[in-house]
């Protein structure tokens, strides 16, 4: 590890750091004594009783704890801050689509639409539970829809009839077999159902693999520090105050290796980049051909045009029900429960929508938002590889850069470390001269097969499938309505890895109240990134 | 080694359409995570940003501009292009293309083309 | 959208001078920014990226500092060559903006 060029024989520099820290001065000699009670420093001359030596040990993982937890709160708060935002504005799609239905088909319809209102109103609340709770039931709602609104909707092509609820009832399941032969509002069902399904599908998934990327990246920083790399912290940083030199700051590719090692088996690298570049395929497909703002539009049109069907071919469809429900009695005149006058149901079921294109309250739109997501996990995507580099970057942990080729705390004593840094996988961590890996703990598992799942779950609903239903729709993968869209430039191409460079430092957190703690003041001893973008 | 070249008409007639692309070499435009981007600077002003095309086809634009903008990108030729409707004497600039890489500075820059417009 | 304020919007110091340039964001702007040299008739230039990282191959004597809404663009000892018009830019939010740039002369 090379050697120590000068001996220090007291001990007043750590009494002083020491003290400053709150430790009792009477733990602590004012000269070296004999080394042989340590169990982790050299066993040599020491200022180091052996409960000094443990409380330093617990000081050292609280150091290092604090620093991953400051670094990567800045991550954090990323992903809950685009978790927020995207399920704020998905919600207030919902909510200005239920509006604006409601205003277009009072318009239209008059009183038509607001004596059915609440069936309206109940798909809006089944398309909300769908995406906020349960993620099932979305095809029976839809159903129930349709179905709700051809027995409200037939009852007024025949004024002259009165309608039993056996008839309804008949109707209803016409409507529902599986050959599909009515069709009374024709292929608007299928439609709506295929543009909702992969719009709602494709924004649970993304506002829930932000929470999962939150939650699993929150419990990956709280990570407890094991026996073997709270012995290499101690010899990184506590060992210095024990042998009398707190002022000789760790080497670099010392603090470089522990930090390795103590964080190779923790984090989430391998599925990290899989997990952002699905977070990217699928925000990207929800601003194109999977698009929520137009799918959200489209609701009260498709309605619209499924009305326009049954009245344009309401003979044919009448035929067909009569033929299969029986022929309703005729109306009393006296009894006759007042029916919408004929005027209103023989006018146009035509809704004319507005062509202007909807916001949100805080004028957000999705276009917006999906590119503050790539600016945003841009910052991200090394964080994991990067976060070595990134605690051996505070004054506390390792020497300077500047300082680089100046004598430094080997571990040992003061010199140069000679050891190779090892960076890499767990596999290239066998080889770390300052720890033994372990592999990855039970809970660490569990983290990234979270994470994996998630992944999986988002890029599943890219494709227009829903993971969350056992089985997938066979309708999923059909074209959407006609939207003009280029999926990419060029086939297969996914909004994935921008060209390799070295990670960026931690970012302060945004203030925009979440209440996240803030990073640790020195953020940004990051090696200068490299910049010379490959093409 | 990337480089971009912005090519077009140097004089336009007011009300009518500025036209200019931007040719890239030395790298592919439908690299991924690639934003291909316009600036302009009216002579002795400063810089604005027209508006970016991402590699995926997803277009934004600067609001101040959006109603006469539209960029476009050829990969065939690996170019793409800025077009700019009902111009006037206002929009007589220097016109940059540039990359941008999400979450980064526009870099690199072609050299900019001198747009006048005038009748 | 966020304005972003340079000021000076001119300056004029001395070679050897330490010269100091500021940036505010009308918002809060993390540390998306980035500044960029513009000599005369030729394209800007990245010098610095993220507020406070040297871009590479720029001399040691530039440097930036800042987070939020307050940056700060700093040239240690002026060199006749750093004559040009520097501009800040955020890409926090869209529209990308720029500031309106300040021109720096030599006395």
């Known amino acids: 590890h090379g050697s120590e060029a000068k001996v220090v024989r007291s001990c007043a520099e750590t009494r002083q750091v020491l003290g400053a820290r709150g430790y009792s001065l009477n733990l602590i000699p004012p000269s070296l004594i004999s080394g042989e009670h340590l169990q982790v420093c050299p066993q040599e001359y020491t200022c180091c009783s052996s409960e000094t030596e443990q409380k330093l040990i617990r000081d050292a993982e609280v150091t290092f704890r604090g620093l991953v937890e400051d670094s990567g709160s800045f991550l954090i708060h990323t992903l809950a801050a685009r978790h927020r935002k995207f399920n704020e504005f998905f919600r207030e799609m919902l909510s200005i689509s239920q509006h604006s239905l409601a205003q277009l088909f009072s318009h239209s319809y008059g009183r038509l639409y607001s004596q059915h209102a609440v069936i309206f109103n109940s798909l809006f609340s089944g398309l909300r539970d769908y995406y906020e709770k349960s993620g099932e039931g979305l095809d029976d709602t839809l159903a129930d829809f349709w179905a709700q609104l051809l027995e409200r909707a037939f009852p007024l092509l025949h004024p002259q009839y009165s309608f039993p609820p056996d008839f309804l009832l008949c109707l209803t399941r016409l409507t529902s077999t599986a050959d599909g032969s009515l069709q009374p509002f024709g292929d608007s069902p299928r439609r709506l159902r295929l543009q909702i399904s992969r719009a709602l599908v494709a924004a649970r998934a993304l506002v829930q693999g932000l929470e999962t990327g939150r939650n699993v990246v929150s419990e990956a920083l709280k990570v407890p520090v094991l026996e073997g790399c709270r012995q290499a912290l101690m010899r990184l940083i506590g060992c210095p105050l024990c042998r009398g030199v707190p002022s000789l700051m760790p080497c670099r590719g010392f603090c470089l290796n522990v930090a390795h090692g103590c964080l190779s088996s923790r984090g989430l690298e391998p599925e990290w980049g899989g997990y952002l570049d699905g977070l990217l395929l699928l925000a990207e497909k929800l601003q194109g051909p999977f698009s929520f703002e137009l799918a959200a539009e489209s609701i009260g049109v498709k309605i619209s045009e499924g009305l326009m069907h049954l009245q344009e071919n309401s003979v044919k469809v009448s035929a067909k029900v009569f033929q299969e429900c029986g022929t309703p009695h005729p109306v009393q005149s006296r009894s006759r429960r007042a029916p919408a006058p004929r005027e209103e149901a023989s006018r146009s079921w035509r809704a004319s929508a507005e062509e202007e294109r909807p916001t949100t309250a805080a004028g957000t739109n999705l276009h917006r938002l999906v590119w503050e997501l790539r600016e945003r996990l841009s910052r991200v995507r090394g964080f994991w590889a990067g976060l070595p580099v990134t605690v051996c970057g505070d004054s506390r942990m390792a020497a300077d850069l500047s300082q680089e080729t100046a004598p430094c705390w080997t571990g040992v004593g003061r010199g140069r470390y000679m050891s190779p840094v090892v960076v890499g996988s767990l596999n290239e961590q066998l080889h770390n001269p300052e720890l033994d890996t372990s592999s990855p703990d039970v809970p660490t598992r569990r983290r990234r097969l979270h994470l994996r799942a998630a992944t999986a779950r988002m890029k599943a609903a890219a494709l227009g499938q829903d993971l969350d239903m056992h089985d997938a729709d066979e309708d999923a993968s059909g074209s959407g309505g006609g939207q003009q869209y280029a999926d990419d430039w060029k086939a297969g191409a996914v909004p994935v890895v921008p060209p390799a460079r070295p990670p960026r430092p931690p970012r302060p957190p945004r203030r925009d109240g979440l209440g996240v703690r803030g990073g640790s003041g020195s953020a940004r001893y990051n090696q200068g990134r490299s910049r010379n973008l490959g093409s | 080694q990337l480089q971009l070249q912005e090519s077009g008409p140097g004089l336009v007639k007011p009300s009518e359409t500025l036209s200019l692309t931007c040719t890239v070499s030395?790298?592919?435009?439908?690299?991924?995570?690639?934003?291909w981007s316009w600036i302009r600077q009216p002579p002795g002003k400063g810089l604005e940003w027209i508006g970016s095309i991402y590699y995926s086809g997803s277009t934004y634009y600067n609001p101040s501009l959006k109603s006469r903008v539209t960029i476009s990108v050829d990969t065939s030729k690996n170019q793409f292009s800025l077009k700019l409707s009902s111009v006037t004497a206002a929009d007589t600039a220097v016109y940059y293309c540039a990359r941008r890489v999400s979450g980064h500075p526009f870099d690199p820059w072609g050299q900019g083309t001198l747009v006048t417009v005038s009748s | 959208d966020i304005q972003m304020t340079q000021s000076p919007s001119s300056l004029s110091a001395s070679i050897g001078d330490r010269v100091t340039i500021t940036c505010q964001a009308s918002q809060d702007i993390s540390d998306y920014l980035n500044w960029y040299q513009q000599k005369p008739g030729k394209a800007p230039k990245l010098l610095i990226y993220d507020a406070s990282n040297l871009e590479t191959g720029v001399p040691s004597r530039f440097s930036g500092s800042g987070s939020g809404t307050d940056f700060t663009f700093t040239i240690s000892s002026l060199q006749p060559e750093d004559v040009a018009t520097y501009y800040c830019?955020?890409?926090?939010?869209?529209?990308?903006?720029f500031g309106q740039g300040t021109k720096l002369e030599i006395k």
């Open positions: 030395g790298g592919s435009i439908s690299s991924s995570s690639y934003y």
């Open positions: 830019q955020q890409y926090d939010n869209l529209p990308i903006t």
